[in-house]
């Protein structure tokens, strides 16, 4: 059974992930971002279901494509280089989802824009955090 210390650690990691995803979204939605229209043309893939930490596998698999799109507006909109930002997220995701079980992600048929993709994972983090508190 999860201990209060492990729950607290999970909660902190989720909050960190949430902040990182929100920072990316804010950087993209920044009114000074001239690349937004172009960035919205890139397709991202969403999980059919995202209710448990193991479903973060679906986020992990889309992190590299996310980094490529962020590279297009790297210097003006983010405090960190996309490579470092995605690397930080990857570390948190790996810790949160665990490596004990190999989960095969199932994706929804319809694609999403980068904004929809980020909003989906922000909602996921908020939802899991709310169950822990």
């Amino acid at each position: 059974a999860p201990t209060s210390s492990s729950t607290k650690k999970t909660q902190l990691q989720l909050e960190h992930l949430l902040l990182d995803l929100q920072m990316i979204l804010n950087g993209i939605n920044n009114y000074k971002n001239p690349k937004l229209t172009r960035m919205l043309t890139f397709k991202f893939y969403m999980p059919k279901k995202a209710t448990e930490l193991k479903h973060l596998q679906c986020l992990e698999e889309e992190l590299k494509p996310l980094e490529e799109v962020l590279n297009l507006a790297q210097s003006k909109n983010f405090h960190l280089r996309p490579r470092d930002l995605i690397s930080n997220i990857n570390v948190i995701v790996l810790e949160l989802k665990g490596s004990e079980t190999t989960f095969m992600c199932e994706y929804a048929d319809e694609t999403a824009t980068i904004v929809e993709f980020l909003n989906r994972w922000i909602t996921f983090c908020q939802s899991i955090i709310s169950t822990l508190t």
């Epitope: 001239p34 690349k35 172009r38 043309t41 890139f42 397709k43 991202f44 893939y45 698999e61 889309e62 590299k64 494509p65 980094e67 490529e68 799109v69 590279n71 297009l72 507006a73 790297q74 210097s75 003006k76 992600c105 994706y107 694609t111």
Partner: antibody, heavy 121, light 113 residues
Framework: QVQLVQSGAEVKKPGSSVKVSCKAS????????IHWVRQAPGQGLEWMGW????????NYAQKFQGRVTLTADTSTSTAYMELSSLRSEDTAVYYC??????????????WGQGTLVTVSS | DIVMTQSPDSLAVSLGERATINCKSS????????????LAWYQQKPGQPPKLLIY???TGQSGVPDRFSGSGSGTDFTLTISSLQAEDVAVYYC?????????FGAGTKVEIK
């Protein structure tokens, strides 16, 4: 049709810089990234970086960071690659290339004819 | 960076025969979301820039003869020339177009036997 025309061959001394140009025609230069790839004599292909001519945003391969500068002049539809602190190992054919799509890592469908840069004392 | 390993280094094939080139990546090039493999093949003749033949592992570039085909998934890929023609003598390169930096194999030289 899409065309990328590069400047002529250069012979440079070690320690100096070289600036290669790539003039785009047949499309709007601001619609696609321009990549630079080099090929040493008898060797394989090595990606150096890309520039988005629309806003000058760049992304360089780590190996060339600090030594390569990519720029673009939208008024003349020309992209430039400047490589500094040249050494003999930089002797290569330098290509500019454009992909089929705006995607940063889409494969390169259009290539310049190449510019041979020879570094020799 | 993803390392691309091609084999063989060179290949001599009789006219009209099949030529097969292999390419292995150090990590998977399959994006699970769209089930696409981000691998391209190029042909380069002496004194010319590379020419894109295939991308997404098996999608032929417009205007490329259909004797050129690509296959494979994950980390193992193959370029096949079904019936070698004299004009196919060249060096062939694979390239991953999955993540920055895009990286190339060392090349395979195809000659007439």
């Amino acid at each position: 049709q899409v065309q990328l025309v590069q400047s002529g061959a250069e012979v440079k001394k070690p320690g100096s810089s070289v600036k290669v140009s790539c003039k785009a025609s047949g499309y709007s230069i601001t619609d696609y990234l321009i990549h630079w790839v080099r090929q040493a004599p008898g060797q394989g292909l090595e990606w150096m970086g890309w520039i988005d001519p629309e806003d000058g945003e760049t992304n360089y391969a780590q190996k060339f960071q600090g030594r390569v500068t990519l720029t673009a002049d939208t008024s003349t539809s020309t992209a430039y690659m400047e490589l500094s602190s040249l050494r003999s190992e930089d002797t290569a054919v330098y290509y500019c290339a454009r992909s089929l799509d705006y995607d940063p890592i889409y494969p390169f469908a259009y290539w310049g004819q190449g510019t041979l840069v020879t570094v020799s004392s | 960076d993803i390392v691309m390993t091609q084999s063989p280094d060179s290949l001599a094939v009789s006219l009209g025969e099949r030529a097969t080139i292999n390419c292995k990546s150090s990590q998977s090039l399959l994006r699970n979301g769209n089930q696409k493999n981000y691998l391209a093949w190029y042909q380069q003749k002496p004194g010319q820039p590379p020419k894109l033949l295939i991308y997404y592992a098996s999608t032929g570039q417009s205007g490329v003869p259909d004797r050129f085909s690509g296959s494979g998934s994950g980390t193992d890929f193959t370029l096949t020339i079904s019936s070698l023609q004299a004009e196919d003598v060249a060096v062939y390169y694979c390239q991953q177009h999955y993540i920055t930096p895009p990286t190339f194999g060392a090349g395979t030289k195809v000659e007439i036997k």
